[in-house]
Amino acid sequence: LNTTILTPNGNEDTTADFFLTTMPTDSLSVSTLPLPEVQCFVFNVEYMNCTWNSSSEPQPTNLTLHYWYKNSDNDKVQKCSHYLFSEEITSGCQLQKKEIHLYQTFVVQLQDPREPRRQATQMLKLQNLVIPWAPENLTLHKLSESQLELNWNNRFLNHCLEHLVQYRTDWDHSWTEQSVDYRHKFSLPSVDGQKRYTFRVRSRFNPLCGSAQHWSEWSHPIHWGSNTSKENPFLFALEAEQKLISEEDLGGEQKLISEEDLHHHHHH
């Protein structure tokens, strides 16, 4: 595995993920056994989990993790202060927000404390490893007889995220999807009044602030349906377990909020 890292002068430096220090011996010693790969993900730039497969070790071993930032003011080697465990064996390390510097090259080193020469070092670009929380507060606005607009919120700097909207009707066998840029708004121009619709959204830290490949989890789905009647606009909303809210500032538009998000607001 190779990781491309940006050097301070902007040049790319392709460096092997693992630097194995081994004894110069013909026989296979403990120190030549490869250490598991460390996988790091930054969750919503609130905390970071760096984990490894502890069960890949030939015998249960409490591997230790050290980290630092290359060529920066934060280049002092730090010990993991919050280990994650799997069956009482270290399997990860959690770093808090203050320890995360997205735009500096993060260096993580895994070590076998019983064999200090058995260690592996990886360099990671954290801005490519951000996973945002799922979008929330999905709302639907009926802009006209046949047009719906979907809006949502993210607990993050919105301009850093791109989004993927999936929608379907009760007649469909597969999702239809549409990419959406940082504006977190999606419009469906032609709605069939005889069908029920379901929408869901996920987000990714790409491309303006990073180049993450991993998407967030999907939002709770929100539904819109055929028997939202003019006489009783609450009919379908209640049947579909959604709450239909009339808001003066919507200029008479109907606004549909998913029940999960409504509960969230009530409890906070």
């Epitope: 993927l164 009760d170 066998h173 597969s174 069908k195 029920r196």
Partner: antibody
């Protein structure tokens, strides 16, 4: 005529791995999301996983999440299920089906037996 | 997760009978409900989607109705080839997609 033909099943020990394949013909494969649904001997139907039309997103049942991976190759009209860390309770007939949540067409299934 | 409960679990009927199978969801699923037929040793076959829409090629003696939590599959005049197991399936709140436990329809 629509055809979905599964292969790759067999007998495997607990903790082992298998890769199932499904060859599709008779319909426009990339117009459809695809799914795997299993049926334990003498039991009902259990949805396992679905993948969207372009392979960009997938959903999994909690019972297989982290152990099974669904994928597809639209150029070859093929659907796959990589199964690892298999357990006795994964023993079932595995069907591939067209659609992500409405299953229009089904294969006859391939039998996976997990036994020591 | 949404639970789907079918009733009865099994039933005996004769050719020409009108048969009704019910499916109840643990919460409202609007009309996101599908019905399948499975014969022994065969793959399931889609009969009804969106609660009441007949899949292409399925005989018109099959019909579906219901919305919200309660749904029915009706066979207006039972034919010999209709003896099979029937499953309902919700796709309202996914994942997961969930099926009913099945209703076995046997010859009386």
């Amino acid at each position: 005529e629509v055809q979905l033909v599964e292969s790759g099943g067999g007998v495997v020990r607990p903790g082992g791995s298998l890769r199932l394949s499904c060859a599709a013909s008779g319909f426009t494969f990339d117009d459809y999301g695809m799914s795997w649904v299993r049926q334990a001997p003498g039991k009902g139907l259990e949805w396992i996983s679905s993948i969207n039309r372009n392979g960009g997103s997938a959903d999994y049942a909690d019972s297989v999440k982290g152990r099974f991976t669904i994928s597809r190759d639209n150029a070859k009209n093929s659907l796959f299920l990589q199964m690892s860390s298999l357990r006795a309770e994964d023993t079932a007939l595995y069907h591939c089906a067209s659609g992500e949540f409405r299953f229009d067409y089904w294969g006859q299934g391939t039998l996976v037996t997990v036994s020591s | 997760d949404i639970q789907m409960t079918q009733s009865p679990s099994s039933l005996s009927a004769s050719v020409g009978d009108r048969v009704t199978i019910t499916c109840r969801a643990s919460q409202s699923i609007s009309s996101y409900l599908n019905w399948y037929q499975q014969k022994p040793g065969k793959a399931p076959k889609l009969l009804i989607y969106a609660a009441s829409s007949l899949q292409s090629g399925v005989p018109s003696r099959f019909s579906g109705s219901g919305s919200g939590t309660d749904f029915t599959l009706t066979i207006s005049s039972l034919q010999p080839e209709d003896f099979a197991t029937y499953y309902c399936q919700q796709s309202y709140s996914t994942p997961p997609i969930t099926f009913g436990q099945g209703t076995r329809l046997e010859i009386k």
